[in-house]
């Protein structure tokens, strides 16, 4: 029951975690910059994410712009976009393959073969997790120096959006998710040898004379 | 002490492009925050930025002669330059370089003047 | 770009006097991020270079006498003279350095 139960919670949090990557991966806030304008009225806010970029007036009106050119792109932006929608897609793969080795589905029959392929899905949330993590980390990276670069005037200075944290605690479900997964897999084999080998029991050998122990007979 | 000193022709040709070099002592170009600001001033005129280069590469240069100036460095020599292609009577000016700190110019130089004649 | 507007363009006053003059920006140099204004003054005495007087609006760079005073915010500014000095005898430019390209108004001139 403890292993199902590991296995449950490990796919929640992975699910989770998952959604909010998908979130991530869509929202315009990567980075944010606050223009205060000459007054309340004119106050704006700039977002930038990896499909689009947008500007939120304070009287709540929002325009958003596409980008449409993939070569005007910057690499960073190219490479986020590459690395966070091949998590994405790596998470969906995670899916099935985590629920073909759970004990409550028949897609593998029981066994250590079915072991193998939950601890699989858990390794792959683990992968997703850390393969998201490398662009959202690599973008603050980013942000942060740019930030205090004295090149960069204060108009170009942008902060870290909301997009980045959603991502972040996506990726933590993710990897939290997928070590439960691996943890329940274990568990379910009772620690088994990695390699899952066939144990047999040797039959007794006949004495020389060819006759059997009388023991062995009632 | 910052010093910079502006070194050109003096006078060159319409078409001809314009070499300038900034020769500075009292600060380094590899030194993180530094940069050097290129601007003119037309005589009986106002002040017009043309470039910065910094001590990481980054350059930032005015839209408007966007597609005729080059900047550049050469820190080991202590040395900065702008390079202003197709020259006409209107680039007749001052040009002076300037050390900055951020985006202000704390440090300039004496200027040189530049004249556009044929 | 942001374009920067002086007025007046030449103002003619006496030693001791007080002397104020305006720079206006085409747009807010306020950066909400520290609240701070991104304008800056230059003097430049006939036949010098410029020297940096002020920054962040308000801001002395050192060295500079305390009868210079910056104020305004977002799109006015003001520099003022508390009493003119025959020294101060100059051009007067403001810039902004909020954003690039740096730009500059087209300078007030002041004479003694």
């Known amino acids: 029951m403890g292993s199902a139960a590991l296995e449950i919670l490990g796919l929640v949090l992975c699910l989770v975690g998952w959604g909010g990557l998908i979130l991530a991966c869509a929202l315009p806030q990567w980075r944010i910059y606050s223009y205060a304008g000459d007054n309340i009225v004119t106050a704006q806010a700039m977002y930038e994410g990896l499909w689009m970029s947008c500007v939120s007036q304070s009287t709540g009106q929002i325009q958003c712009k596409v980008f449409d050119s993939l070569l005007n792109l910057s690499s960073t932006v190219q490479a986020a976009r590459a690395l966070t929608v091949s998590a994405v897609l790596l998470a969906f793969v995670a899916l099935f393959v985590t629920l073909a080795g759970a004990q409550c589905t028949t897609c593998v029959a029981p066994g250590p073969a079915k072991a193998r392929v939950a601890l699989t899905g858990g390794v792959l949330y683990l992968f997703c997790g850390l393969l998201a993590l490398v662009p959202l980390c690599w973008f603050a990276n980013i942000v942060v120096r740019e930030f205090y670069d004295p090149s960069v005037p204060v108009s170009q200075k942008y902060e870290l959006g909301a997009a980045l944290y959603i991502g972040w605690a996506a990726t933590a479900l993710l990897m939290v998710g997928g070590c439960l997964l691996c943890c329940g897999a274990w568990v379910c084999t009772g620690r088994p040898d990695l390699s899952f080998p066939v144990k047999y029991s040797a039959p007794r050998r006949p004495t020389a004379t060819g006759d059997y122990d009388k023991k062995n007979y009632v | 002490q910052v010093t910079l000193k502006e070194s050109g022709p003096g006078i060159l040709q319409p078409s001809h492009t314009l070499s300038l070099t900034c020769s500075f002592s009292g600060f380094s170009l590899n030194t993180y925050g530094v940069g050097v600001n290129w601007i003119r001033q037309p005589s009986g005129k106002g002040l017009e930025w043309l470039a910065s280069?910094?001590?990481?590469?980054?350059?930032y240069i005015n839209p408007s002669l966007k597609n005729r100036l080059t900047v550049s460095k050469d820190p080991s020599n202590n040395q900065a330059f702008l390079e202003v292609t197709n020259v006409d009577p209107a680039d007749t000016a001052t040009y002076y370089c300037?050390?900055?700190?951020?985006?202000?110019?704390?440090?300039w130089g004496q200027g040189v003047m530049v004249t556009v004649s044929s | 770009d942001i374009v920067m507007t002086q007025t007046p363009s030449s103002q003619a006053v006496s030693a001791g006097e007080k002397v104020t003059m305006s720079c206006k920006s085409s747009?807010?140099?306020?950066?909400?991020?520290?609240?701070?204004?991104?304008l800056a003054w230059y003097q430049q005495k006939p036949g010098q270079s410029p020297k940096l007087l002020i920054y962040?609006?308000?801001t002395r760079e050192s060295g500079v006498p305390d009868r210079f005073i910056g104020s305004g915010s977002g799109t006015d500014f003001t520099l003022t003279i508390s009493s003119v000095q025959a020294e101060d005898l100059a051009d007067y430019y403001c810039q902004q350095h909020y954003s690039y390209p740096l730009t500059f108004g087209s300078g007030t001139k002041l004479e003694i």
């Open positions: 962040l609006t308000s």
């Open positions: 747009q807010s140099l306020l950066y909400s991020g520290d609240q701070k204004n991104y």
């Open positions: 280069i910094w001590w990481h590469g980054k350059t």
């Open positions: 300037a050390h900055a700190r951020a985006q202000l110019l704390d440090y």
